[in-house]
Structures are given as C-alpha cells and as structure tokens.
C-alpha cells in the first residue's frame, strides 16, 4: 500500500496567517491527491482534488500544489472558519490511503493547568472496580504529561486520557486521565498521586490523596 505522511501533526496559527501543510507519499501518485477539511462531529469536506483543483464552492485562499510524492496545502490567509483538521488522501491506487491529519489550532498564550485528583466513589467501589481521575483544566499548549504513582510506584498501561476540543473563548484545553484498578488492587495501596508536567509549569505538579482519608 502507498503510505501517506502528513506534517506537522498540529499547527498553531492566528487569523490572517499563511499556513502550509505537507503530505508525502511513499511512492509516486502523479497528482492523484485530494485534501479534506474536517470539524468535530462533522463529515469531511472535499477542498481540493487532483492535487491543485479547487472543489466548487471552496474559497480561493486554499491552494494545493505538488506532484509525484510531495504535496502541499496552503491557506493564504487563515480565517476563523479554517480552524479544523486537514487530511490528504491518495487515489492513485485502489487502497486510497489517508494521511494521519493536521490539526490547525488557535495560537494561544501559555497557560498552566489547574490540577485536581478525585478518588473513586463508594458507589463505584461496590461494583468491584476503582477509577481514580486526574483533571487538568484550562491549559495551553495541548501537550501535557500525566504520570500516575501508587505508593510511589510508577503505573503504566492502566490509564486512559481524554482531551477536550480547544475552547473557542480562551483557546485552552482540558484533560482527564483515568487510572482504573480492581477494587482489590485499589484497597492494597494507600497513596494515589498524579504528576503533571506542562510547559506552563516551572516544575511538575503532584496532586495526591491517601485512600480512606478523603
């Protein structure tokens, strides 16, 4: 299969900026390339086909170029409606592979997260599982690292993260990380902590609780 690689994966920009997204094919696809725009919860919208042909109704600020293996999508002057995720797709071969996407986000100012930790509810413990939640509120940029420690032992493979879409008012993100354990495992340990690293923090922030003392 022909693989498609997009860069960057995220692009932070302001209204009026000129932005360029690159798509590379693992082998020549001539000009059999399409570009799509997608917004959360919406179907993809075709912007460009045959590498540089503008789909009907698409504003002329969208410019496609390239052939062979290297392609670009340029937005000449970014508008508020253009903050979205962009995908390239080859259709030289029947497999019609997509790139992994480039998210064009609003460039914000660095903001440190507010961090909170929540123990499992008694109600949940009755069901035999325990979820500990670490909540990071209103931070920018999106990159944040959450590490779980149980009795100071680093946990891996038993947590899941969920990040909100960028807030339209202040350009920040929020994130929740959920550590899931069986009730039996949860009750074997005392100190539960989440450690957060972010560009807006001069050093990592740790929030913790002692089981049974909440």
């Amino acid at each position: 299969d022909i693989q498609m690689t997009q860069s960057p994966s995220t692009l932070s920009a302001s209204v009026g900026d000129r932005v360029t997204i690159t798509c590379r094919a693992s082998q020549s696809i001539n000009t059999w390339l399409a570009w799509y725009q997608q917004k959360p919860g919406k179907a993809p919208k075709l912007l460009m086909y045959k590498a540089s042909s503008l789909e009907s109704g698409v504003p002329s600020r969208f410019i496609g170029s390239g052939s062979g293996t290297e392609f670009t999508l340029t937005i000449s002057s970014l508008q508020p409606d253009d903050f979205a995720t962009y995908y390239c797709q080859q259709y030289n071969s029947d497999s019609k592979m997509f790139g992994q996407g480039t998210k064009v986000e609003v460039k914000g100012t660095v903001a440190a997260p507010s961090v909170f930790i929540f123990p499992p509810s008694d109600e949940q413990l009755k069901s035999g599982t325990a979820s500990v939640v670490c909540l990071l509120n209103n931070f920018y940029p999106r990159e944040a690292k959450v590490q779980w420690k149980v009795d100071n032992a680093l946990q891996s493979g038993n947590s899941q993260e969920s990040v909100t879409e960028q807030d339209s008012k202040d350009s920040t993100y929020s994130l929740s990380s959920t550590l899931t354990l069986s009730k039996a495992d949860y009750e074997k340990h005392k100190v539960y902590a989440c450690e957060v690293t972010h560009q807006g923090l001069s050093s990592p922030v740790t929030k913790s609780f002692n089981r049974g003392e909440c």
Partner: nanobody
Framework: QVQLQESGGGLVQAGGSLRLSCAAS????????LSWFRQAPGKEREFVAV????????FYSDSAQGRFTVSRDDAKNTVYLQMNSLKPDDTAVYYC??????????????WGQGTQVTVSS
C-alpha cells in the same frame, strides 16, 4: 444537498456478522461509485471497499477481502456492507462516501457521519 446516512453498526462478538447500510438522498447513486472507509481510535481513516457502478463490480482492501461483501441497490439509493467473521481488529467507526464525479475519481465530495462497530473478544 447530498446526504449519506449509515446504519447497522453495533456490538458483536468475534466471529459474528453485521450488515451496514448507507442510504443516500439528494443524488441518484446509479452513476456513482460508493465506498466504505473505517477509522479506529488513533489511526488513519482506511479504505475498506468500493461498490462501483452497477455491472462494474467491487474492490476490497486486503483486510476486507474474503470476509466483507459490498453491494448496492440503486432503486433504493442504498449501498450495503455485509461483514462476516468479524475480529476485534475490525472495531472502528465505519463511513460511506460517494465519488465526486461519475468516473471513479477516488476523491469524495460527500461523507456520512459514520456508524460504530465494536467487536468484543
């Protein structure tokens, strides 16, 4: 305005079957190829199968070949994806899309919102 609406997704055990439907409105599909794609969390959207214009057959991805069958009912303006011998790896949101012109362009001007397929082991 062209609209595509997928249905038929759900939770199924490994080895089971599902039949997805994609109903089109606003465009007569008989002159167009319709394709199925899927997207698993954190992965690229990938091609599954295409139902070319009636009489022109179908094409499948390697992962769908032999297990999935795409068909179309132009009178009902609907395309189907019959999925058999499902595996946990088939868990994804499944989308249908219609070609942007009558000559298998391979670019798609309209997409459905998707239907979730979850295969449990």
């Amino acid at each position: 305005q062209v609209q595509l609406q997928e249905s038929g997704g759900g939770l199924v055990q490994a080895g089971g079957s599902l039949r997805l439907s994609c109903a089109a409105s606003g465009r007569t599909i008989s002159r167009y190829a319709l394709s199925w794609f899927r997207q698993a969390p954190g992965k690229e959207r990938e091609f599954v199968a295409v139902a070319r214009r009636s009489g022109d057959g179908a094409f499948y991805s390697d992962s769908a070949q032999g297990r999935f069958t795409v068909s179309r009912d132009d009178a009902k303006n609907t395309v189907y994806l019959q999925m058999n011998s499902l595996k946990p790896d088939d868990t994804a949101v499944y989308y249908c899309a219609i070609d942007s012109d009558t000559f298998y362009s391979g670019s798609y001007d309209y997409w459905g919102q998707g239907t979730q397929v979850t295969v449990s082991s």
